[in-house]
């Protein structure tokens, strides 16, 4: 190879060693008779070499720094190109260097051709491993202001008081144009202006200078987006610090197009607004901060660019001025990320404050927007607190637990409508009365409606589900102790269509002991499936539940029991069920930690079944499953 | 055998113009950089120009900058110095040179010279 | 520019006497390849000048033994260890380092 720099280029080269690999052989840089591993060559001088091995791309690697003095006269501007060519240069890894050095009023302007840059961040690197390197200067200090690879949406970085803009191109990349120009300008009186231009749908993730260590002290960075007419623009901060000021605020300003107070000003920590037309500008500014301790300021966030749906430029006013103790949250039901470019989905309040979740809470009526390609992506969750503090003003009092109709208004799905129903404790107990007897989910049986409800304990300390039941079954009633939350979860969207057969009263009634108490009317035509709370936990130690069974008066119930044993040991205390006739009270008792559980059994008339738990030994749970079924009377059972 | 044959030289006034020729045998001419190196009458030596292998490169001495331009014809094994607003201080004995094929700007061979003479 | 600067200027030698030539660069001609990129020449009266030394110290093919390169850095010396008649001539130093490419004033060496 042979290299010879003309001596007013003011380009050096230098070969030297890359990072050290395990392999066994040395390799040498040879010019004339001599070995070395470093070699440097300056303006004017001219230089002959090979290489001691094949591969010398696993060895070396060559800098090309090309020095542009924009100080002592006229600036070199226009397309950069890569001096030498690389077609002369040794086929190894390569990064050319571009330090230009200019007056602190002049602001210098970089152009990156199409395809454009991407930034990335720390840990990341670039597919084809052409990565362009930026650093700005603040007086003598130097500050990164990026590290980008092609196909990208930044077009245009401007600088002032000097740029060193470094291009990494791996030894087996045919590239020979730098791929940029550079230009003059007038003074940009900040850090840097950031250019991001965006042809259609798509994203970028942009940091502050230096990322992820921290922005320069009370320094200003902008960045200046190019969104076309037709489409929307939203901003998010995926991550970001603050220092520790002690003059001025850090902050961002917006140039928002249309916008009646630009600058509009945001803490780092606020939501950023979303659904923007057109180009915006964002700054970042730093503040003074403290000597002792600085802190850092630093910040990455991504500008999302995509179609406004049609839904997009329609407001939806939730009314929950009226409803107390109430929050409603928007947000993406949980799927696989493809790793394709993804359109963001958000839900905007004033249709301005973007993001991806959104809770609303009670007592204002707030209006709401999308931006959103598919609204299927997006489901609502709804809880609302029932309390009651005064016992002697709640007793006998019913609340319907119905899905307010404004929800059905909205283009999302309802995926749980939670009430929270508080009693006092030891005071009153609840009962549920559903508008349609329901129907326990279980395997044998299980529920096919659009919606459940799902009835659980609402104490914190106790781990006690109830079951999932939906419409269409036997359950007239289910009585709680205390505190429970009832959860309407949707599963299909034709709940909207069956909304009507929702709808459940809850009522505060005088406390009683047991956990829960199910009121059953089986029906003629099927089998009622029962089972004991907590199913394949095991009910909790030391609970009572109990089976309200009615039997109508020309029918005859068959009881039975899904396994011969329960499998419960115990640890402490008894484990037994009472079986009970309603019109005798005569009453029969198992002991269902020793006992086999008894054979189908006939109940002509009304009974209960009650189960109490002991302390069971672990793994080895209490849970019960057993069924109804009717038959007339006049059928001969012997 | 190397051989350099540099021709073109003579009388020329001040201000005119000159081009000086070096014909090269006995290697790969296409190979070399190639130098114009000259001697004023009782004085040393001064490099004037350079020109690379393809003449892609060529460099000057700051004095003949702007005035004198080299060219080679590889197809001819050929160089050439083109001289304009020759100056007195332009006289002297051009040589052509090869730089030898090992770093740096060495010369190894050169030929005879020719004498250019700029004088009214 | 690098200057180059040689002494003595005169140098009346006795046949099979030494004689030896000094030349000072304003900068290193040592290079980061290890290499010092200083050539001697001789010019011989009414001939065009020919290599001796290349590289600080290498003999250039078909100059005779007797002729020696030495030095780095900035300080290099010829030395020819006996002077016969035939080395008459002007001898040069020059900087081979970079471009442009300059030449010592020259040293007379003549027999007495």
């Known amino acids: 190879f042979e290299i010879a720099l003309p001596r007013e280029s003011n380009i050096t080269v230098l070969i030297k060693l890359g990072t050290p690999t395990l392999l066994a052989k040395p390799c040498y840089i040879v010019i004339s008779k001599r070995h070395t591993t470093m070699l440097s060559i300056k303006p004017g001088e001219r230089i002959l070499f090979t290489f001691s091995c094949q591969s010398p791309e696993n060895h070396f690697v060559i800098e090309i720094q090309k020095n542009i003095d924009c100080m002592s006269g006229p600036c070199p501007f226009g397309e950069v190109q890569l001096q030498p060519s690389t077609s002369l240069l040794p086929t190894l890894n390569r990064t050319f260097i571009w330090d230009v050095k200019a007056h602190k009023s002049i602001g210098l302007e970089l152009q990156f051709s199409i395809p454009r840059l991407r930034q990335f961040g720390p840990g990341e690197s670039c597919p084809d491993g052409v990565t362009y390197s930026i650093s700005g200067r603040i007086d003598a200090t130097v500050v990164r202001i990026g590290t980008f690879c092609s196909n990208g949406t930044v077009s245009r970085i401007k600088m002032q008081e000097g740029v060193k803009m470094a291009l990494h191109l791996p030894w087996f990349h045919p590239r020979n144009v730098s791929g940029f120009s550079i230009a003059n300008r007038s003074s940009i009186k900040r850090l840097c202006i950031i250019e991001s231009v965006f042809e259609g749908e798509g994203s970028a993730t942009l940091m502050s200078a230096n990322y992820p260590e921290g922005f320069p002290e009370d320094e200003l960075m902008t960045w200046q987006f190019v969104i076309p007419a037709h489409l929307r623009a939203s901003v998010s901060f995926l991550n970001f610090n603050l220092s520790n000021c002690e003059r001025k605020e850090e902050r961002v300003e917006y140039y928002i197009p249309g916008s009646t107070t630009n600058p509009e000003v945001f803490k780092l920590e606020d939501k950023q607004p979303g659904n923007m037309a057109g180009n915006f500008n964002l700054s970042l500014q730093g503040c003074d901060q403290d000597a002792q301790n600085p802190g850092i300021l630093r910040l990455q966030f991504q500008v999302l660019v995509q179609h406004p749906q049609n839904e997009s430029n329609k407001i939806y006013v939730v009314d929950l001025s009226n409803e107390r103790a109430t929050s409603l949250t928007i947000e993406p039901r949980p799927v696989k990320q493809s790793r394709k470019f993804v359109p963001g989905c958000f839900v905007c309040l004033e249709s301005r404050t973007c993001s991806t979740n959104l809770t609303l809470t009670s007592g204002s009526k707030h209006k709401i927007s999308f931006l959103c390609d598919n609204l299927t992506r997006l489901w609502m969750n709804v809880e609302k607190n029932i309390s009651c503090t005064d016992h002697r003003y709640c007793q006998r009092k019913s609340y319907s637990l119905q899905v307010p109709s404004d929800i059905f208004h909205l283009p999302v799905e309802l995926h749980d409508f939670s009430w929270k129903l508080l009693v006092p404790k030891d005071r009153l107990s609840l009962v549920l009365v559903p508008a349609q007897k329901l129907q326990q989910h279980t395997h044998e049986k299980p529920c096919n409606t659009s919606f459940s409800y799902l009835v659980a304990s609402a104490i914190p300390s106790q781990d006690l589900y109830f079951g999932s039941f939906c419409p269409g079954g036997s359950i007239e009633q289910i009585q709680v102790k205390q505190n429970i939350s009832v959860t309407l979860r949707t599963f299909a969207p034709s709940f909207r269509q069956e909304a009507s057969r929702q709808g459940l009263t809850v009522s505060f009634i005088p406390y009683f002991k047991e956990e829960g108490v199910f009121t059953v009317t089986p029906d003629t035509k099927s089998k009622v499936y029962l089972r004991t709370p907590n199913w394949d936990r095991g009910l909790p130690s030391l609970t009572s539940v109990s089976w309200n069974i009615s039997v109508p008066r020309d029918q005859v119930a068959c009881l039975t029991f899904f396994k011969e044993r329960t499998g419960v040991v115990c640890q402490t205390g008894r484990a037994f069920m009472i079986i009970q006739e309603q019109r005798t009270r005569a009453e029969e008792i198992f002991s269902l930690d020793e006992d086999a559980l008894p054979k189908p059994r006939f109940h002509h008339h009304s009974f209960w079944v009650n189960i109490s738990n002991c302390s069971p030994a672990s793994g080895k749970q209490l849970d019960l499953l057993f069924w109804v079924t009717l038959t007339p009377r006049t059928v001969d059972l012997t | 055998e190397v051989q350099l044959v540099e021709s073109g030289g003579g009388l020329v006034q001040p201000g005119g113009s000159l081009r000086l020729s070096c014909a090269a045998s006995?290697?790969?001419?296409?190979?070399?950089?190639m130098n114009w190196v000259r001697q004023a009458p009782g004085k040393g030596l001064e490099w004037v120009a350079n020109i690379k292998q393809d003449g892609s490169e060529k460099d000057y001495v700051d004095s003949v900058k702007g005035r004198f331009t080299i060219s080679r014809d590889n197809a001819k094994n050929s160089l050439f110095l083109q001289m304009s607003s020759l100056r007195a201080e332009d006289t002297a004995v051009y040589y052509c040179?090869?730089?030898?094929?090992?770093?740096?700007?060495?010369?190894?061979?050169w030929g005879q010279g020719t004498l250019v003479t700029v004088s009214s | 520019d690098i200057v180059m600067t040689q002494s003595p200027l005169s140098l009346p030698v006795t046949p099979g006497e030494p004689a030896s030539i000094s030349c000072r660069s304003s900068r290193s001609l040592l290079h980061s390849s290890g290499y010092n990129f200083l050539d001697w020449f001789l010019q011989k009266p009414g001939q065009s000048p020919q290599l001796l030394i290349f590289?600080?110290?290498d003999r250039a093919s078909g100059v005779p033994d007797r002729f020696s390169g030495s030095g780095s850095g900035t300080d290099f010396t010829l030395k020819i260890s006996r002077v016969e008649t035939e080395d008459v001539g002007v001898y040069y130093c020059?900087?081979?380092?970079?471009?442009?490419?300059?030449f010592g004033q020259g040293t007379r060496l003549e027999i007495k």
């Open positions: 006995g290697f790969t001419f296409s190979r070399y950089w």
């Open positions: 020059m900087q081979a380092l970079q471009t442009p490419i300059t």
């Open positions: 590289l600080g110290s």
């Open positions: 040179a090869r730089v030898m094929y090992s770093s740096g700007w060495s010369f190894d061979y």
